[in-house]
Amino acid sequence: AGVFELQIHSFGPGPGPGAPRSPCSARLPCRLFFRVCLKPGLSEEAAESPCALGAALSARGPVYTEQPGAPAPDLPLPDGLLQVPFRDAWPGTFSFIIETWREELGDQIGGPAWSLLARVAGRRRLAAGGPWARDIQRAGAWELRFSYRARCEPPAVGTACTRLCRPRSAPSRCGPGLRPCAPLEDECEAPLVCRAGCSPEHGFCEQPGECRCLEGWTGPLCTVPVSTSSCLSPRGPSSATTGCLVPGPGPCDGNPCANGGSCSETPRSFECTCPRGFYGLRCEVSGVTCADGPCFNGGLCVGGADPDSAYICHCPPGFQGSNCEKRVDRCSLQPCRNGGLCLDLGHALRCRCRAGFAGPRCEHDLDDCAGRACANGGTCVEGGGAHRCSCALGFGGRDCRERADPCAARPCAHGGRCYAHFSGLVCACAPGYMGARCEFPVHPDGASALPAAPPGLRPGDPQRYL
C-alpha cells in the first residue's frame, strides 16, 4: 500500500503567441481546482477506462478576479498535495490525466458552475520511494507545471511497496533469510503476511493478504484438494504438466461489487464495502455531488432529481457516459458523404472531400463543367467529381483540342486507301470492292451485291464515309 502524491506548481499561459484570455473577470470571479486520475500500466489515457489506480480532487484555490487589461498570469492555486492512496502494489508504469477546472462564482441560478479549462495526459515510469519527478505539460495555450512521486505506507517498502519492513529484533542482524531494508538499514525485511488462514502447506503469497494455491489445491485458503476425476490423462495432481487441474473459484469471484467496492463472501452470497463516493448494496450508487466536479471534458453538472442520482452530467458534443468520460467516435456515424474522409478533431468534425465535392459534409456536388469549355464543338459531360468532353467528329483529347486522325485505325477494307476529309474519312476502294469502307465485293458481271449505287457514284469510285 502507498500514496501517489501530486504537487501543482503553476497553471498559466504557455510560452509563445496567442496567450489565453484570463478565465476569470471582475464580472465573473472564479477559482481553480484540479482532478487527477491514475490508471495502471501504459494504458490509453483517453478517459474511457475508469481510474483503476485511483483519483483525487484538490481543494478549491483562492478566488481570482482578473485585472482589466492585464494578460492572464499564473493563476492562484489550491493549497496542498493531491493524494491518491493505492491499496495494492504500485505498478511502476502508470497513465495519468490531470484536469484543471474553473469554478465560476457569479450569481448563477442553482449555485456555482464548473467548466473544464485544460486537460493533460501522459504515461510514465515511476518507482515508489524515489524522489519527486518534475513535469511540464501543455494543453492548448495553457501550461501546467507539476511534480509527482509514489511513496509506500509503512510497513511496506520497495519500488512496488510489496516488501514489508519491521524494526530489528536484534541489534546486529536480521533473521534467517531476511535482508536489511534499504534505505532503512536499522529495519529488516519482514516475511510476507498472507491472507489470514491461508494454508501454510498448500498456499503461498507474493503480495500481502494474498493466498495462492500450490498445484492440486484450491479454495480461498488453499485447503480444498482439487478433484482429479475429470482428468483426461492418468497423470495425478502431483504432475507438473497436468492439464486438468482447474483452480476453484476464489472469494467473490468476478467481483460483483461495482465502482471498485471490495467484496467479501457470506455463506450464500456476498457483501460489498464501498469506496468513498459510492453507496448502495453493490456500491452501484454514486454519492458524488456536483461539488466534487465529477463531469469530465467540460460536461455541465446538474444536481440529480432523485436521491439515488446525486448529479447528472450534461456532456458537450463529442463526449458521452455518466461522467462525460467517453469520447464519441463520431466518424463511426459516417457523416462525410460522397466518399469524403472523416477527421474527428475533438472540438469539431472535419470532412476531407474528394475532388468534385464540397461543403461541411461533402454534400455539394460541384458543377464539374462550370467554366470548362470543350473545344471544337464538343459537349461537356459531368460525372463523379470530374468532367469529360464528348468530342465532335474529327476531334479528341480531354478538351477536344486535338485533331483526330480518322485513318489511324485503318478503316478501309480490302486494301482500300484512306483519305482524311474535313467531315470524316473517305475510302478509295481497290478494284472489285465497294461500299463506305470497301467492305462489299463487286460481282464479276459488273452487278453489285448492294442495291444500285447512288446517282453520281460509280462502283469503284471513292466512297465517302459520313
Epitope: P249, D253, G254, P256, T266, P267, R268, S269, F270, E271, C272, Y279, G280, L281, R282
Partner: antibody, heavy 116, light 106 residues
Framework: QVQLQQWGGGLLKPSETLSLTCAVY????????WSWIRQPPGKRLEWIGE???????SYNPSLKSRVTISVDTSKNQFSLKLSSVTAADTAVYYC??????????WGQGTLVTVSS | DIQMTQSPSTLSASVGDRVTITCRAS??????LAWYQQKPGKAPKLLIY???SLESGVPSRFSGSGSGTEFTLTISSLQPDDFATYYC????????FGQGTKVEIK
C-alpha cells in the same frame, strides 16, 4: 425457524399506491437482507428490491422510480410502497429474507389486483 | 440488466428419471446463481446457491453446476415430490429470474 407474515394489498385502482408490510417472527430483522419479489399470473418471478438492516436499498431499475422499501427494526417489520400502479402491477407479492440477492425464507404471498 | 434463459420450458419425466435443466445468462455472473422450486399456490423454496452449494435440508439428489454463463440443475432420481416449476436466479447484479421450467409427469 424464521417465519414471515405479510399483509396489505388487495384490490387497487390505477394510479393508487400499493402498500405491503411483512413481519418477521422467530428471528431479528437485523443482520439480514429483506426483499420483495412479485409474480404476475402465469409469469416468471420478478425481483422488486431489497434492504439491509442499516436501511441501504437496492431496487430493480425498471421499478426504481416508483418503489420505496423501508425497515423498522424495532417492530421487526419491513414494508413496500409502489406508487402509480397500473394493471401491469397485478401480481402475487412475496416478502423474503436472506442474504444479498438471495431469499432463503419467504412469506405466504399476497395477491394484488389493479383494476378500474 | 442480465437476462436469464432456461431450457426446456416444460419437461415430461417419470419417477426415477435423471433430469437436467439448463440456465443461460446473457453475460457472465461468475457463480452467483441460485435455483428455486415452486409448487402451485406456494412460495418458492431455495434449493441451490452459489451455483453448486446445496441449501440445508434439501435432498442430495439435487445438484447444481456451472459458472460464467452456463448452469445446470440436476435431479439424479426424480421423486413424486419433485414435480414442480424450477427457476434459476442470478444475483451478481441486482437479481433476475429465468422464465421457469415445469417438470411434469410423463
Amino acid at each position: 425457524q424464521v417465519q414471515l407474515q405479510q399483509w396489505g394489498g388487495g384490490l387497487l385502482k390505477p394510479s393508487e399506491t400499493l402498500s405491503l408490510t411483512c413481519a418477521v417472527y422467530g428471528g431479528s430483522s437485523s443482520g439480514n437482507y429483506w426483499s420483495w419479489i412479485r409474480q404476475p399470473p402465469g409469469k416468471r418471478l420478478e425481483w422488486i428490491g431489497e434492504i439491509n438492516h442499516s436501511g441501504t436499498t437496492s431496487y430493480n431499475p425498471s421499478l426504481k422510480s416508483r418503489v420505496t422499501i423501508s425497515v423498522d427494526t424495532s417492530k421487526n417489520q419491513f414494508s413496500l410502497k409502489l406508487s402509480s400502479v397500473t394493471a401491469a402491477d397485478t401480481a402475487v407479492y412475496y416478502c423474503a429474507r436472506g442474504e444479498l440477492g438471495i431469499a432463503d425464507s419467504w412469506g405466504q404471498g399476497t395477491l394484488v389486483t389493479v383494476s378500474s | 440488466d442480465i437476462q436469464m434463459t432456461q431450457s426446456p420450458s416444460t419437461l415430461s419425466a417419470s419417477v426415477g428419471d435423471r433430469v437436467t435443466i439448463t440456465c443461460r445468462a446473457s453475460q457472465s455472473i461468475s457463480r452467483w446463481l441460485a435455483w428455486y422450486q415452486q409448487k402451485p399456490g406456494k412460495a418458492p423454496k431455495l434449493l441451490i446457491y452459489k451455483a453448486s452449494s446445496l441449501e440445508s435440508g434439501v435432498p442430495s439428489r439435487f445438484s447444481g453446476s456451472g459458472s460464467g454463463t452456463e448452469f445446470t440443475l440436476t435431479i439424479s432420481s426424480l421423486q413424486p415430490d419433485d414435480f414442480a416449476t424450477y427457476y434459476c436466479q442470478q444475483y451478481n447484479s441486482y437479481s433476475t429470474f429465468g422464465q421457469g421450467t415445469k417438470v411434469e409427469i410423463k
